[in-house]
């Protein structure tokens, strides 16, 4: 018993003064607690416990059942305990068949005995079947038997707890033992999409996936530079042993546009921690942003192809998308296609083919897409590059000599003098008047140049050369005359087309 | 002995809420999850959440997400469950049940069970 | 979501009859199972968890097998306290979710 100390407060007395108790079945506890500021008697055993405020605990007629640990509390909250064993040779064993024990920890079999005094406290495999070799464990009758460093391999072992009595051998009733692994290594987490694009008002939902050995793995959903709690559901399922699957589902109804940011799913266990994040963008309407992908202004030569060629950004999606050249739609030579088969993708290509261009094929080709908020359009202003074809070689009544070349780009018109017979004209005549003249075609035609020189300038037979060129090529016309006396004899122009 | 008792029957308003307590005794409350179970007349039983004592964490069934609170107060050994937008529907009997021979509220089953609350809802 | 599927609904027997209740998990649940028998007005009783373990004061009469998603509660020798509704349980995930219960009725 506590020695008493004045001044003091010293823990109460129980009577009687024994650390261990023994009665038998049917027979009567009756427990004392002395001390003037008594408060309560506990009584535990395995996970029960129950309280009395009387300082004398009687069980008129006790069963195994009351086998445990009696302790008396007094108001300094100082107490004493007596542990009571009701024998009962029906019930050798207490039993609690919950049985988890930690991977690399030590875990209590809950099987107190009734009966300190019977022999041989341990373990047995069920139906006969041996334990594991490198199983210990360290039996106590007042608590159970203690398996010491659990190994994963133990899961779902079948034991009961042993005792001889009397020479024979009574098992307890079976406990499962279930293994809760260690963890060692760090979740393995995921997101369903790594960004997300929504109009105000449109519901943000995404699940983040958490791996594990075991479900005591911790997750959540974070918002990056914000301590909000946000709002998650969870779905969870055990695919095997060892095999935890949890899917932590965030929610925004409704979402705004200052809901945009980086959120985090954030897993940790006991050996290290895991996050992945998914971004989340919210606009107030859609858009549609266009890319052309070759310049704007295109210039293509006579009889060969260009791709116009244009990337664009929809969201929502696109719903119509068209070519137009001269207010007309095509509704073959193009493409339109995403650029990702990503399920997040918003970039989608779109292309025209134009094939063997003419002359008068230049101009402006639209491409035109909308979605259900915008429309937009891109404008490509094509030239097809054509060699001089020259229109008119003519001698004017006024005695001018007069070239009329078209082309693209712009061409050129110089003159030559030819004396004689030559075949090569190299003396170069001056022009007296130059013109660009308006085109009666399309826009992005031919561009027309009208270009004069003087005949009276010339005193000899010869041949005068009209050349018109540009980059693609360059077209010539002669004029033939010769002197009669003083006179000119008709002049017989005639035309010589070079590559 | 272990038990858990349940508070009293209650008859609510539509729209309005209802907070059942369960109070545990017997047991180390921290040590076990509490559920909670409901039964609409002549129909099966249905799941509706769980807290852990030991910290709080709760997780609900989707039909009830929102709509279900769930709190605990370890000084009284006692879970509550509130039930808030109440419908026609929620008319049934509620229980409280602790996951017994379980692991983190898996596996096991639901060994005791309180006597459950009766909650009518009225227009 | 993990539905269970009971079967049957209900059912009529006798005293010392044999009852088979089985339940059909929609995936694997390990053996994540329990069965409860309930009697009218009164809370549900836990009878088996972990598909095969009899819980404590529950008369032997009671068993349960199976593993992954098919299970079975077996009544050997129906007795007049047995006739209840019996509902199975899985615990292998979240949300819980219950079997639609079978009523085993006297013939």
């Known amino acids: 018993q506590p020695s008493v100390s004045p001044g003091e407060p010293s823990p109460p007395s129980i009577h009687p003064g024994k650390s261990d108790l023994i009665v038998r079945v049917g027979d009567e506890i009756r427990l004392l607690c002395t001390d003037p500021g008594f408060v309560k008697w506990t009584f535990e055993i395995l996970d029960e416990t129950n309280e009395n405020k009387q300082n004398e605990w009687i069980t008129e007629k006790a069963e195994a059942t009351n086998t445990g640990k009696y302790t008396c509390t007094n108001k300094h909250g100082l107490s004493n305990s007596i542990y009571v064993f009701v024998r009962d040779p029906a019930k050798l064993f207490l039993v609690d068949r919950s049985l988890y024990g930690k991977e690399d920890n030590d875990t209590l079999v809950r099987c107190p005995l009734t009966d300190p005094e019977v022999t041989n406290y341990s373990l047995k495999g069920c139906q006969g079947k041996p334990l594991p070799k490198d199983l210990r464990f360290i039996p106590d009758p007042k608590a159970g038997i203690m398996i010491k460093s659990v190994k994963r391999a133990y899961h779902r072992l079948c034991l009961h707890c042993s005792v001889d009595q009397e020479g024979k051998s009574v098992l307890s009733e079976k406990f499962i033992l279930k293994v809760r692994p260690a963890f060692k290594a760090v979740p393995v987490v995921s997101v369903s999409k790594a960004s997300y694009l929504l109009r105000e008002g449109e519901e943000f939902t995404v699940t983040c996936t958490i791996k594990d050995v075991s479900s005591s793995v911790y997750s959540t959903w974070k918002r990056e530079n914000s301590q909000t709690k946000l709002q998650e559901k969870y779905n969870s399922w055990h695919h095997g042993d060892f095999n935890y699957e949890r899917q932590a589902t965030l929610t925004i109804s409704s979402a705004r546009v200052n809901d945009s940011g980086v959120f985090m799913c954030y897993a940790n266990n006991t050996f290290g921690s895991a996050n992945v994040t998914t971004t989340l963008e919210v606009v107030d309407k859609g858009f549609i942003n266009i890319f052309p992908m070759i310049n704007t202004t295109v210039f293509v030569n006579d009889g060969e192809n260009v791709d116009l060629i244009v990337e664009y950004e929809a969201f929502p999606k696109p719903e119509h998308q068209q070519w137009i050249y001269m207010n007309r739609t095509f509704t073959d030579k193009w493409e339109d296609y995403p650029k990702s088969e990503n399920e997040s993708n918003i970039r989608y290509v779109s292309e025209l083919h134009l094939t063997r261009l003419k002359g008068t094929e230049g101009g402006t080709y639209t491409f035109l897409v909308s979605n259900s908020d915008v429309n937009a359009a891109i404008a490509f202003n094509v030239y097809v590059n054509t060699k001089p074809e020259i229109l008119t070689y003519d001698r004017l009544v006024n005695g001018m000599l007069q070239c009329v070349a078209a082309g693209f780009p712009e061409p050129t018109i110089d003159w030559y003098f030819c004396p004689g017979t030559e075949q090569r004209c190299s003396a170069s005549v001056l022009p007296v008047d130059v013109q660009t003249l308006n085109s009666s075609g399309p826009p992005f035609g031919k561009l027309v140049v009208q270009s004069s020189i003087d005949s009276s300038a010339f005193k000899h037979n010869g041949t005068v050369e009209c050349k018109a060129y540009n980059d693609v090529g360059k077209t010539s016309a002669y004029f033939n005359f010769a002197f009669k006396g003083n006179n000119k004899e008709q002049i017989h122009p005639h035309t010589l087309f070079t590559p | 002995q272990v038990q858990l008792v349940q508070s009293g029957a209650e008859v609510k308003k539509l729209g309005a809420s209802v907070k059942v307590s369960c109070k545990a005794s017997g047991y180390t409350f921290s040590s076990y999850y509490m559920h909670w179970v409901r039964q609409a007349p002549g129909q099966g039983l249905e799941w509706m959440g769980v807290?852990?004592?030991?910290?709080?964490?709760?997780n609900f069934a989707q039909k009830f997400q929102g709509r279900v609170t769930m709190t605990r107060d370890t000084s009284t050994s006692t879970v509550y469950m509130e039930l808030s937008s109440l419908r026609s529907e929620d008319t049934a009997v509620y229980y409280c049940?602790?996951?017994?021979?379980?692991?983190?509220?898996?596996?096991?089953?639901?060994?005791?069970w309180g006597q459950g609350t009766l909650v009518t809802v009225s227009s | 979501d993990i539905q269970m599927t009971q079967s049957p609904s209900s059912l009529s027997a006798s005293v010392g009859d044999r009852v088979t209740i089985t339940c059909r998990a929609s995936?694997?649940?390990?053996?994540?199972l329990g069965w409860y028998q309930q009697k009218p007005g009164k809370a549900p009783k836990l009878l088996i968890y972990?598909?095969?373990s009899l819980e404590s004061g529950v008369p032997s009469r009671f068993s349960g097998s199976g593993s992954g998603t098919d299970f079975t509660l077996t009544i050997s020798s129906l007795q007049p306290e047995d006739f209840a509704t019996y509902y199975c349980?899985?615990?292998?995930?979240?949300?819980?979710?219950f079997g639609g219960g079978t009523k085993v009725e006297i013939k």
């Open positions: 972990d598909a095969s």
């Open positions: 807290i852990n004592p030991n910290g709080a964490g709760t």
């Open positions: 995936q694997g649940i390990r053996n994540d």
């Open positions: 049940a602790r996951h017994g021979r379980g692991y983190e509220g898996y596996e096991g089953a639901f060994d005791i």
């Open positions: 349980q899985q615990l292998n995930g979240y949300p819980l979710t």
